[in-house]
């Protein structure tokens, strides 16, 4: 996905968990300079901002997700101990200095480890 | 009902710019992503540019190189898209066309079109 | 970018007839972020499906989308006469927003 001088992939467009597993949500990009990333979680319940960073500077985590996620500088992030309220839709947006921006969607799905699963 | 009307459209040159305008009336403009679509002559469909609400973001095609730039006035609800350095391949129909009322997700899908304006890129 | 690819490129059906489009997406893209247009001459397209199986407001029933993974489909039951025109399938979940070649469904 290449736009404006931003480019963005995306290797695993849908992800399937179980409770309690750390996922990462993976992606790739490029662009020129040092662009803003940010994460917006969206379902049934309602959307929101899960994280905003510039690479190589602190990440403004939301609230909401304090300790539960962590940033790393290709724009990926992980997910920590994930349950099923966290099933939904992850959007990075990859935003370069000028203003033009790339999107991508991850869907999770998450589900309960049935006891028959285990046997 | 959602009217969209286009304006600016026209006949230039090679490398001469030109001005798309784009005014919505029937819905509240500020929750609304807008977005140009364009169909050159016996072509199909081709996405342009998108502008949301909330966010502001702004996102492009590959094709424009950085040629086009979209920005958008809430009070006015108005979406300009300046096309800087035309070429003969930018000749087509533009749509400006509205998304769905942002409400919990990003979907960027089009919902309410204009009729189109015109721009022919000619010698 | 995703690349979307719709077949046949003309079907040549009749009034009643029931028509099958297809369109194949180059990456596994969520059934969500689908979309399904109908584009007459000298008219403005119009949405007929979102989300790969919501019919959009006014939409007649006999209209219909599903598919998942790369591989969507628009079936029109039983097509009317103003049924015959040019089907486009586009993807939103990820940029740049791409639309397939359409496919023309004519009068045999």
């Known amino acids: 996905l290449q736009s404006q001088g931003v480019s963005l992939y995306i290797p695993q467009a849908t992800i399937n968990a179980t409770v309690k597993e750390d996922i990462l949500l993976s992606v790739e990009y490029s662009c020129h300079g040092v662009p803003t990333i940010e994460w917006t979680y969206s379902s049934n319940w309602g959307t929101q901002k899960i994280v905003e960073w510039k690479p190589g500077t602190q990440a403004n985590i939301s609230q909401s997700h304090k300790d539960r996620v962590c940033t790393f500088d290709n724009g990926s992030i992980q997910l920590f101990s994930v349950g099923v309220r966290d099933s939904g839709y992850y959007v990075i947006t990859v935003t370069e200095r000028l203003g033009s921006s790339q999107f991508g969607t991850i869907v999770l799905h998450v589900s309960e480890i049935l006891y028959e699963d285990l046997h | 009902e959602v009217q969209l009307v286009e304006s600016g459209g026209g006949v230039v040159k090679p490398g001469e710019s030109l001005r798309l305008l784009c005014t919505a009336s029937g819905l509240s403009f500020n929750k609304y992503s807008i977005n140009w679509v364009r169909q050159a002559p016996g072509g199909g469909l081709e996405w342009v540019s998108s502008?949301?609400?909330?966010?502001?973001?702004?996102y492009y095609a590959d094709s424009l190189e950085g040629r086009f730039t979209i920005s958008r006035d809430n009070a006015k609800n108005s979406v300009t898209l300046e096309m800087n350095s035309l070429r003969v391949e930018d000749t087509a129909l533009y749509y400006c066309?509205?998304?769905?009322?942002?409400?919990?997700?990003?979907?960027?899908?089009?919902?309410?079109w204009g009729q189109g304006t015109l721009v022919t890129v000619s010698s | 970018e995703i690349v979307l690819t719709q077949s046949p490129a003309t079907l040549s059906l009749s009034p009643g007839e029931r028509a099958t489009l297809s369109c194949r997406t180059s990456?596994?893209?969520?059934?969500?972020?689908l979309a399904w247009y109908q584009h007459k001459p000298g008219q403005a397209p119009r949405l007929l499906i979102y989300g790969g199986s919501n019919r959009a407001t006014g939409i007649p029933a006999r209209f219909s989308g599903s598919g998942s993974g790369t591989d969507f489909t628009l079936t029109i039951s039983s097509l009317e006469p103003e049924d015959f025109a040019v089907y486009y399938c586009q993807q939103y979940g990820s940029s740049p927003l791409t639309f397939g070649g359409g496919t023309k469904v004519d009068i045999k």
């Open positions: 502008i949301e609400s909330g966010s502001g973001h702004i």
């Open positions: 990456q596994s893209s969520p059934s969500d972020n």
């Open positions: 066309v509205s998304g769905p009322e942002d409400k919990w997700l990003l979907q960027l899908y089009f919902e309410s």
